[in-house]
């Protein structure tokens, strides 16, 4: 058993049929010694008396809010949550496996630049009685500070018969050094509580590996005289790290016909303009990627050829 | 050229070669993103290789103030990686494919380090500890980790030279 926060405790249980469970001793936080009784949740049934209560925690029916009273007055509470371990593996029932980039990916994170700011998100089908708490650090043995906000519900989607809820959190490294080569990964830890079930999820990454620039901005076409060619120009996204002479991007320019089956013409360039042939009903798209480190490409910015 | 007296390197040549190094490092190991090294244990390997750190003066302001600190740091790292790529981790069994970019990568590391410090100029004697012997089954993972770290190292070096070529070239 360990304390998650004040008056909230997590009991770690090996979860299998007829498991013996864990013996837990609760102590009433009071100077009083006599006349103390214990109840669980809303029930008025007295579970025991005295300053301590010993219980055998085996299942969710044994978890909940234990309250000690004296003469009708509440003295203190202890909320017991369960953390299940099945076949040596902690349960992951609350969050959905996003399976990208690999199986057992529950948390996904992205950064728009090298400033030390990043966003993580996760999915669940649970809509109520759900809380999340997020902590992060750079490195684990001698951790350096990363500050995370509160997790918020950021999207709701219908998937078949199910509703899916996306939660996200923004974090900022306290003393980020954008130009340095990271040697210690960022660690993100999410505590999830659904009713009386506790679970924790972790992710470990370097900012450089989760970089995904915003799409290029101000995408414009300039027809070239007496030609089917156009000059496409664009700018670095506002959110990208500066100076651009140091934090450089490379770009992919694509000409795509109306039909998905039509051949795509692609040009790669380090410049912020390119000359391409604009076909009728086609569109021109540009995306960006760090020039020197192959992290994710941005989403496409597009304009129609017409 | 970045010589101990403090004169400038051939920024544009360094930029071109460092960008080539980035390409080679990724072609030598394009799928690194699909393997989580931290699951493999042995964080010592990533602790053992050079890193360009915050105080090394490789940020835009540090380069403007005095690029020598950063260039020396990059030079040290290039020599270090060049020695690793020339060691039996890469030359021993299992043999690399004949068309593997590792050979080119090795030569380019040497080329860039020589651009930074031509013959006759010495920042310091380059020291590298004796490598632990490795078995064939360990080498694949070691190669993977070294190339993964090298990708991050040369990315910073390439940014430095690109910025230098754009803002510090005579």
């Amino acid at each position: 058993i360990w304390e998650l926060k004040k008056d909230v405790y997590v009991v770690e249980l090996d979860w299998y049929p007829d498991a013996p469970g864990e013996m837990v001793v609760l102590t009433c936080d009071t100077p009083e010694e006599d006349g103390i009784t214990w109840t669980l949740d809303q029930s008025s049934e007295v579970l025991g008396s005295g300053k301590t209560l010993t219980i055998q925690v085996k299942e969710f029916g044994d978890a909940g809010q234990y309250t000690c009273h004296k003469g009708g007055e509440v003295l203190s509470h202890s909320l017991l949550l369960l953390h299940k371990k099945e076949d040596g593996i902690w349960s992951t029932d609350i969050l959905k496996d996003q399976k990208e980039p690999k199986n057992k990916t529950f948390l996904r994170c992205e950064a728009k630049n090298y400033s030390g700011r990043f966003t993580c998100w996760w999915l669940t089908t649970i809509s109520t009685d759900l809380t999340f708490s997020v902590k992060s650090s750079r490195g684990s043995s001698d951790p350096q500070g990363v500050t995370c906000g509160a997790a918020t519900l950021s999207a709701e989607r219908v998937r078949g018969d199910n509703k899916e809820y996306e939660y996200s959190v923004e974090c900022q490294e306290d003393s980020a050094c954008p130009a340095a080569e990271e040697s210690l990964p960022i660690e993100v830890m999410v505590d999830a509580v659904h009713k009386l079930k506790y679970e924790n999820y972790t992710s470990s990454f370097f900012i450089r590996d989760i970089i995904k620039p915003d799409p290029p901005k101000n995408l414009q076409l300039k027809p070239l005289k007496n030609s089917r060619q156009v000059e496409v120009s664009w700018e670095y996204p506002d959110t990208w790290s500066t100076p651009h002479s140091y934090f450089s991007l490379t770009f992919c320019v694509q000409v795509q016909g109306k039909s998905k089956r039509e051949k795509k013409d692609r040009v790669f360039t380090d410049k912020t303009s390119a000359t391409v042939i604009c076909r009728k009903n086609a569109s021109i798209s540009v995306r960006a990627q760090d020039r020197y480190y192959s992290s994710s490409w941005s989403e496409w910015a597009s304009v129609p050829c017409s | 050229r970045a010589v101990p007296g403090g004169s400038s390197p051939a920024w544009t040549q360094c930029q071109q070669l460092s960008q080539k190094l980035c390409t080679l490092a990724w072609s030598a190991h394009p799928l690194v993103g699909h393997m989580d090294l931290r699951e493999e244990g042995d964080e010592e390997t990533t602790n053992d290789v050079p890193h360009i750190q915050c105080g090394d003066g490789c940020d835009p302001q540090g380069l403007r103030d005095n690029s020598q600190f950063c260039l020396q740091r990059i030079h040290q790292g290039l020599i270090f990686y060049e020695k690793l790529l020339g060691s039996d981790i890469f030359t021993g069994e299992p043999s690399l494919l004949p068309d593997s970019p590792v050979g080119q990568l090795h030569a380019s590391l040497l080329g860039l380090s020589q651009l930074l410090q031509p013959e006759g100029h010495h920042w310091e004697t380059q020291q590298i500890p004796s490598l632990s012997p490795s078995q064939p089954w360990q080498r694949l993972l070691l190669r993977f980790k070294i190339l993964r770290s090298l990708q991050a190292f040369v990315a910073v070096a390439a940014r430095v030279f690109a910025h230098g070529a754009a803002t510090l070239s005579p």
């Epitope: - | 042995d42 290789v49 020599i79 380059q126 632990s132």
Partner: antibody, heavy 120, light 113 residues
């Protein structure tokens, strides 16, 4: 919890073979290099040899002709044999480990030591 | 092989005093690439195995009191005990692991004056 526990014969006659075994707990012999080190009474420490994570060995050149270090990864044990001992081999013998990395490491955990006396 | 010379051989001090121990290798232990010095310090008490105090010349092993500190680089290293406690009287060894064979210094005995 990381532990190295060693045992073996404590009293030998000259020309016999010293044989010691070290059992390791809390880590694996394919993740850590393991070593033998000795200390003659009232003297300093002397490195004897290492068995690397991959199973290969290296020995102190002074002792090379007489030393064999081997391991049994299934039992998580490794052994030292030193042949043709003389009174100069009287020492406390320690097993120790170092973390496998690109380069040789420092010894972070040690066995309790075994005093081996060579006397006729 | 790399030879480590420790000095002094014996240091006689009283509890509460500062102890400064020196270790000089015959060649540099600094890896210029990763800026690590491949030197460790150990404490040994009679009848006990050596105990790791400091690694990479200046990093304190977990659980070691902060009165122990390591400094130096290349070919000159120092172990400092800022205020000697009664339990600090022992023999101290330096170890190099830059090249194998691993080699130890001859030791410095810190004794009660």
């Amino acid at each position: 919890e990381v532990q190295l526990q060693q045992w073996g014969a404590g009293l030998l006659k000259p020309s016999e073979t010293l044989s010691l075994t070290c059992a390791v707990y809390g880590f694996s012999l394919i993740s850590y290099n393991v070593h033998w080190i000795r200390q003659p009474p009232g003297k300093g420490l002397e490195w004897i040899g290492v068995i690397w994570t991959g199973g290969s060995t290296d020995y102190n050149s002074v002792l090379k002709s007489r030393v064999t270090i081997s391991r049994d990864t299934s039992k998580n044990q490794f052994s030292l044999k030193l042949s043709s001992v003389t009174a100069a081999d009287t020492a406390v013998y320690y097993c120790a480990r170092d973390k496998y990395g690109l380069f040789p490491g420092y010894f972070d955990y040690w066995g309790q030591g075994t005093l081996v006396t060579v006397s006729s | 092989e790399i030879v480590l010379t420790q000095s002094p051989a014996t240091l006689s001090l009283s509890p509460g005093e500062r102890a400064t121990l020196s270790c000089k290798p015959s060649q540099s232990l600094l890896s210029s690439g990763n800026r690590k010095n491949y030197l460790a310090w150990y404490q040994q008490k009679p009848g006990q195995a050596p105990r790791l105090l400091i690694y990479y010349a200046s990093t304190r092993q977990s659980g070691i009191p902060d009165r122990f500190s390591g400094s130096g680089s290349g070919t000159d290293f120092t172990l400092t005990i800022s205020r000697l406690e009664p339990e600090d009287f022992a023999v101290y060894y330096c170890l190099q692991h830059f090249n194998y064979p691993w080699t130890f210094g001859g030791g410095t005995k810190v004794e009660i004056k």
